[in-house]
Structure formats: structure tokens, C-alpha cells
Interface confidence: low
């Protein structure tokens, strides 16, 4: 025969209020026999929850019909839940006794408990762009949740974050809490493909934490670096200068030349390449008429790269028959 | 007797997404968490994620389906779903549905969508 | 993840004759509260996979009394006392501790 076993799946039954709870209890023997009552609690001071002989139990149900003789489903619910209802509930066999029945069993208990998800974890980060070196401050909000116990992390890159400060309201009691978190991440030059993460984990989210995530890419401001030079190859009368603009980011650049202090409208030629580390390189390539008669020529690159204060580069052609070294100097 | 039916095979093309339904009756719904298994041809049982309806939309998935799996359940019509999103041709499999208490034990299954992914 | 391991992979059995099948957890599934979250699936050829025991040694309403399961912590057993030819499919174990739930390989169970 095999021994009775009390089977109480849940270890924790998360209800809402007003919502039915079903506390499932299963049995593996009808023996021995007796009844099955269900408590709230341990000890002398346990409270009877049901007792399917005598007793009166309005927002109590049975999920079967205990009056079956091979019944071995002892599973109940709870109608209209309310914050009273919480606590740990046995179902417990009894076995037959004189003068009264004589407990025999009790099941591992599942703990009641009002609880509700927080909500998936919202970060948002600085109003505006930050170079790199720089402290900015990502916002991470969560709503909606309850028991209050609330675990929050910080994550940059997948790398746990410890400069942050967190707070759950209201901090009495209540139906149900928010977390708000405001964490501090200095800014690298190659952060523009990393990310941070907000981490929430809860004790209905059974081991799963949610995550809200925002991309450094939208906070930082990587600004470029400018080299102008005049390609060794003279074609005729024409020199071929070009300017590189290196690690900038975002994409958003304007680039204009400038002749002697006149700015060109003719077409150059121009490429746009992406880095590994996300951020982009412009390269821009000019065309200048020369002749053995003309003054020397000051080429200018300008770059105004994301609505910034425009950085510029300059090089002095210095043209004669026999073309000469070139020079280049910068301006701030 | 709970028992969970899913809907009809379907056949997808790569790049796209699939729904599959689970609509359970004789039992009670919400309480219960509804998980989804899936089963490759010839090979075994594998976890894609649940939801207990009770305790809203918020579902556990399977780290390798995160992100391309989606799992609802609508209490109204006591039906649970599942998205998976960027089908490529290894997603062609028998997909289940499973009734369990709690995340645990699942006591009750579905008769599986065969999704077959092909160009 | 739990990672379970079923043995063997295929199990040629004689009707009447008594068969066994094997499963390890690579952690302990014994709960607090006492009872192993290890559970036994019998996935009929052609069929969805039915519960055939639960939290270890416990018998599935409706599943007949030839199947038990026994084990502790992380060594489990299936044992099926006569099998039958009904009984051929693939057995699967599942530890129902924590997500994700994780599933045995299986184990090919065919009439010789």
C-alpha cells in the first residue's frame, strides 16, 4: 500500500484582490480514512478555513465533489479575495479517533499572498548630448507592483553599474509600489554602440526579471577630428586636396570649403564610412584650378558636425612652376 | 477534463512570424499557468516560455526565444497565444501547449500546430 | 538552466518483462517543502506527451498503477513493473523546479 503523501503544488499562490483563489490539495491514499479540513496557520491558534462535515463556509467551494467515494482531490476556493486573506494554508488529513478525530497529515502548506508584476522597466536618458569624459543621468521607472520587495540593478554593457540611487513609494503601506532609479554613467568615446540596462526583479516574476534597456548612442556626442592634406599628384592644372573627418558621431555634418576665404558651391566628391566602434569618418575631396601665374591659394575645410560651433582646417597651396611642399596649419 | 485546443498547421516563409492559439476549456484558466513547448521532427521536448493569465501580460520566456517569442492570453476567451517573430527554416516544428499549476507540472496538453517554415 | 540527462537512449523491452528508465539533474530538485519538482512524460508515436508522474513518485490520475517513480535530489528512476505494448514511445523527464523548464533527451522505449 502505498503511504499517503499530502500534495500541495503551489509553494506560493499569488492572488489580486477580489479575484478567486484556488488552494489545490491532492491526496495519494484513501487511507486511512477520515476527513480532509483545510487551516490557515499552525498551532493552537490556526484558523479553520473548511471543513466539509459541519461548519458554515460562504466564500468557500470545492473543486470536486467530496462526496465521491474514490475522491482524492481535496482542492478548494476562495472567493472575493481580500488583504485579510493572506497567510500560509495546510490541507491536513485526520484519521479516525475515540473520542474525536486525530491528525495525521499535513500538507507543506502554500503560502497566500497578494501580488501584482511591476510593470516593464521604462530608462530614459539625458535631454541632450554629452562628450565623451562626461557624467550623464539615465532614469529607470517601474509601476504597478506589490509585495513591496523590489530588487533593482544597473547594468552598462553587461557590467553591473553601482553609482545609482533608488527609491520605492509610497513607503507605507499600500495596494501597490513604484520604483523609481537614477543611475550615473561617465560616457566613453566608444560607447556609442553600448548599452545600459535596468533590471527589476520581483517575486511574481518567478525568477525573471524584467529589463528596460536605452542605447548610449541617443546621449553621447563624439565630435570629429580634422586633417586636411593635399594628395603628392598634380593632374595638369589641377591639385586634388582632401579632408578627412574622423570618429564623429551622430551622423548629422555639414562640411563646406573655402578658396581664399571664399566659400565654394561647386560639387566634390565625398564618402561616408561607419567604424567598428559605430562612430562614422567623412572624407571629402576638392579640386583646385591652379596656374603658374596665380597667387598662392588657402584652402579652408569647415565641419559644423551636429549643431555644434563650427571647426575648420586650413592649407596653404603654395604654387610655382615647380609645385612645393605643402603646408597646413590649423584654426581653433 | 481540462483539454486545450490549438489551432491549424500553418506554413510560413523565412523572415516572417506565426500565431499560434490555445483555447482551453473545462477547467479553470487564469489560475493556471499555460506554457509552450515545442518538438523539432525527430528530436525532443523543448521550453519556450508561459504566462499564468491571473497575473496579467507580463510571460517568462526561454532565454534562446527572448526577444522573437511573444506569449499572450486573453482570460475572456479563456485562449492562450504564442508570436514567434523572424522564422527562419530550424523553427520548423510541432508547437504545444501545456496546462500546469504554476510554472510546475504540466497535466494537460494541446494537440500541437505543426509550423513548417520553408521558401 | 538545469541540464537533465535521461539513460539509455533506446530501451528494446519484452511485453510481461519489467523495464527502467534513468534520469539526472545536473542540481538538486528537492524543494524546500519537501518534494522533488521532477516530473515523467510518455510521448505516444503520433500523440501530444501525457503526464505520467509528478513530483517524482506521485501517479497521474488515470495512469495505471504498473508505472512508479522514485529518486531523490538528483538521481531519479521510471520503473514500468510489466510493460505493455501501449507503453511504447518516447519517455521524457522534466524538472519543474524553476524556469526555464528543462526536459531529458528522452528515452526510445520499443517492443523487441
Known amino acids: 500500500e502505498e503511504e499517503l503523501q499530502m500534495i500541495q503544488p503551489e509553494k506560493l499562490l499569488l492572488v489580486t484582490v477580489g479575484k478567486t483563489a484556488t488552494l489545490h490539495c491532492t491526496v495519494t491514499s484513501l487511507l486511512p480514512v477520515g476527513p480532509v479540513l483545510w487551516f490557515r496557520g499552525v498551532g493552537p491558534g490556526r484558523e479553520l478555513i473548511y471543513n466539509q462535515k459541519e461548519g458554515h463556509f460562504p466564500r468557500v467551494t470545492t473543486v470536486s465533489d467530496l462526496t465521491k467515494r474514490n475522491n482524492m482531490d481535496f482542492s478548494i476556493r476562495i472567493s472575493s479575495i481580500t488583504p485579510a486573506d493572506v497567510g500560509t494554508y495546510y490541507c491536513v488529513k485526520f484519521r479516525k479517533g475515540s473520542p474525536e478525530n486525530v491528525e495525521f497529515k499535513s500538507g507543506p502548506g502554500t503560502e497566500m499572498a497578494l501580488g501584482a508584476k511591476p510593470s516593464a522597466p521604462v530608462v530614459l536618458g539625458p535631454a541632450a548630448r554629452t562628450t565623451p569624459e562626461h557624467t550623464v543621468s539615465f532614469t529607470c521607472e517601474s509601476h504597478g507592483f506589490s509585495p513591496r520587495d523590489i530588487t533593482l540593478k544597473w547594468f552598462k554593457n553587461g557590467n553591473e553599474l553601482s553609482d545609482f540611487q533608488t527609491n520605492v513609494d509610497p513607503t507605507g503601506q499600500s495596494v501597490a509600489y513604484s520604483i523609481r532609479s537614477t543611475a550615473r554613467v561617465v560616457l566613453d568615446p566608444w560607447d556609442v554602440r553600448s548599452q545600459v540596462i535596468c533590471e527589476v526583479a520581483h517575486v511574481t516574476l518567478q525568477g525573471d526579471p524584467l529589463r528596460g534597456t536605452a542605447n548610449l548612442s541617443e546621449a553621447i556626442r563624439v565630435p570629429p577630428t580634422l586633417e586636411v592634406t593635399q594628395q603628392p599628384m598634380r593632374v595638369g592644372n589641377q591639385v586634388n586636396v582632401t579632408c578627412q573627418v574622423r570618429k564623429f558621431y551622430p551622423q548629422s555634418l555639414q562640411l563646406t570649403w573655402s578658396e581664399n576665404g571664399n566659400v565654394c558651391q561647386r560639387e566634390t566628391a565625398s564618402t561616408l564610412t561607419e567604424n567598428k566602434d559605430g562612430t562614422y569618418n567623412w572624407t571629402s575631396w576638392f579640386l583646385v584650378n591652379i596656374s603658374d601665374q596665380r597667387d598662392d591659394v588657402v584652402l579652408t575645410c569647415q565641419v559644423k558636425h551636429d549643431g555644434q560651433l563650427a571647426v575648420s582646417k586650413r592649407l596653404a597651396l603654395e604654387v610655382t612652376v615647380h609645385q612645393k611642399d605643402q603646408s597646413s596649419d590649423a584654426t581653433p | 477534463q481540462v483539454q486545450l485546443v490549438q489551432s491549424g498547421a500553418e506554413v510560413k516563409k523565412p523572415g516572417s512570424s506565426v500565431k499560434v492559439s490555445c483555447k482551453a476549456s473545462g477547467g479553470t484558466f487564469s489560475n493556471y499557468a499555460i506554457s509552450w513547448v515545442r518538438q523539432a521532427p525527430g528530436q525532443g521536448l523543448e521550453w519556450m516560455g508561459g504566462i499564468i493569465p491571473i497575473f496579467g501580460s507580463t510571460a517568462s520566456y526561454a532565454q534562446k526565444f527572448q526577444g522573437r517569442v511573444t506569449i499572450t492570453a486573453d482570460e475572456s476567451t479563456s485562449t492562450a497565444y504564442m508570436e514567434l517573430s523572424s522564422l527562419r527554416s530550424e523553427d520548423t516544428a510541432v508547437y504545444y501547449c501545456?496546462?500546469?499549476?504554476?510554472?510546475?507540472?504540466?497535466?494537460?496538453w494541446g494537440q500541437g500546430t505543426l509550423v513548417t517554415v520553408s521558401s | 538552466d538545469i541540464v537533465m540527462t535521461q539513460s539509455p537512449l533506446s530501451l528494446p523491452v519484452t511485453p510481461g518483462e519489467p523495464a527502467s528508465i534513468s534520469c539526472r539533474s545536473s542540481q538538486s530538485l528537492l524543494h524546500s517543502n519537501g518534494y522533488n519538482y521532477l516530473d515523467w512524460y510518455l510521448q505516444k508515436p503520433g500523440q501530444s506527451p501525457q503526464l505520467l508522474i509528478y513530483?517524482?513518485?506521485s501517479l497521474q490520475s488515470g495512469v495505471p498503477d504498473r508505472f512508479s517513480g522514485s529518486g531523490s535530489g538528483t538521481d531519479f528512476t521510471l520503473k514500468i513493473s510489466r510493460v505493455e505494448a501501449e507503453d511504447v514511445g518516447v519517455y521524457y523527464c522534466m524538472q519543474a523546479l524553476q524556469t526555464p523548464l528543462t526536459f531529458g533527451g528522452g528515452t526510445k522505449v520499443e517492443i523487441k
Open positions: 513530483a517524482a513518485s
Open positions: 501545456a496546462r500546469g499549476v504554476g510554472d510546475d507540472t504540466l497535466t494537460d
